[in-house]
């Protein structure tokens, strides 16, 4: 009775269970009643990352520096190259095929989360009591200066874009 299902790391072909090729190797010829599956190593700059019956290996991804990409993990016969972006840039997609400059947070907004090679800057509006007077990809909202702790008084109120202005207290003569 020919098998209808095969064991793990095997595949069914011509009513027969053949061994799959291991990661890093491609299929040259299926097994027969008398011969084992024939596999061949992937070429340089090619890979296969699973037990497979592929007749062609996949090409390694190229981390093109002209697109702002750099290598995060070199490819091998069993793994693809992993790309990331140069400092100050982040990937435009999960596949990281190109990069864009990190977004800056405008005045009135601060950095909630600094960008990484794979995610953009996350900005948040400065709440009452905090301000940001610069456009930056790193600066958080800063707290208003506390005039009281300096023995001064508020002469000009702060906003989400400006700090308070402190001045001397009016002394009664």
């Amino acid at each position: 009775e020919p098998p209808t299902a095969c064991r793990e790391k095997q595949y069914l072909i011509n009513s027969q269970c053949c061994s799959l090729c291991q990661p890093g190797q491609k299929l040259v010829s299926d097994c027969t009643e008398f011969t084992e599956t024939e596999c061949l190593p992937c070429g340089e700059s090619e890979f296969l990352d699973t037990w497979n019956r592929e007749t062609h290996c996949h090409q390694h991804k190229y981390c093109d520096p002209n697109l702002g990409l750099r290598v995060q993990q070199k490819g091998t016969s069993e793994t693809d190259t992993i790309c990331t972006c140069e400092e100050g840039w982040h990937c435009t997609s999960e596949a990281c095929e190109s990069c864009v400059l990190h977004r800056s947070c405008s005045p009135g907004f601060g950095v909630k989360q600094i960008a990484t090679g794979v995610s953009d800057t996350i900005c948040e509006p400065c709440p009452v009591g905090f301000f940001s007077n610069v456009s930056s990809a790193f600066e958080k909202c800063h707290p208003w200066t506390s005039c009281e702790t300096k023995d001064l008084v508020v002469q000009q109120a702060g906003t989400n874009k400006t700090d308070v202005v402190c001045g001397p207290q009016d002394r009664l003569r």
């Epitope: 190593p41 992937c42 070429g43 340089e44 700059s45 993990q73 070199k74 091998t76 016969s77």
Partner: antibody, heavy 119, light 113 residues
């Protein structure tokens, strides 16, 4: 027997150019990635550039980017390094080395060729 | 870039003695896909080009005597020569083979006492 033979070294003036060659024999050249690695006199090893077996992938060290160009001619079993805008700090023995598709390591090195940049 | 730091810079050991040298990388060299550490050791004898000794941290290249062994994972690696022979006098370089730019340690020079 695997053989890698570099040539093209010599004395060059700062700002000048030089083209190094690496002649490969004893293996199927088109199946292997290739690297250039250099070694300044009395110093350690510094990777310079890589080119994949099929010419598709090329990477450079930041120190040479925009000045050096790696290339290969699989029909001639040859690897090249075009060096422009040479500086005194480029003075070194330049080695070519091959990379296979299994270990992904530099498994054979040539004897090297010395490039001296001086006025 | 990954910085490779080797220690000691040099050491003098008697013939037949055990030699141990260290290599540390500034970030992990573990390939997440195949769980191999891409740390390579090269040997450079005086006046000669480098020669591949060990790849994937601990796999000896064909023809390399079994007195040479590599170990470690992540960021800390070691090369050991179990019994030093006269022909082992050389500089030993560890190398990041995990990512570009490929980077080398400064080397450990092994001499005979």
């Amino acid at each position: 027997e695997v053989q890698l033979v570099e040539s093209g070294g010599g004395l060059v003036k700062p700002g000048g150019s030089r083209r190094l060659s690496c002649a490969a024999s004893g293996f199927t050249f088109s199946d292997y990635g290739m690297h250039w690695v250099r070694q300044a006199p009395g110093k350690g090893l510094e990777w310079v550039a890589y080119i994949s077996s099929g010419n598709r992938i090329i990477y450079y060290a930041d120190t040479v980017k925009g000045r050096f160009t790696i290339s290969r001619d699989n029909a001639k079993n040859s690897l090249y390094l075009q060096m422009n805008s040479l500086r005194a700090e480029d003075t070194a023995v330049y080695y070519c080395a091959r990379q296979d598709g299994y270990r992904y390591a530099m498994d054979y090195w040539g004897q090297g060729t010395l490039v001296t940049v001086s006025s | 870039d990954i910085v490779m730091t080797q220690s000691p810079d040099s050491l003098a050991v008697s013939l037949g003695e055990r030699v141990t040298m260290s290599c540390k990388s500034s970030q992990s060299l573990l390939n997440s896909g195949n769980q191999k550490n891409y740390l390579t050791w090269h040997q450079q004898k005086p006046g000669q080009p480098p020669k591949l000794l060990i790849y994937w941290t601990s796999t000896r290249e064909s023809g390399v005597p079994d007195r040479f062994s590599g170990s470690g994972s992540g960021t800390d690696f070691t090369l050991t020569i179990s019994s030093l022979q006269a022909e082992d006098v050389a500089v030993y370089y560890c190398q990041n083979d995990y990512t570009y730019p490929l980077t080398f340690g400064g080397g450990t020079k092994v001499e005979i006492k």
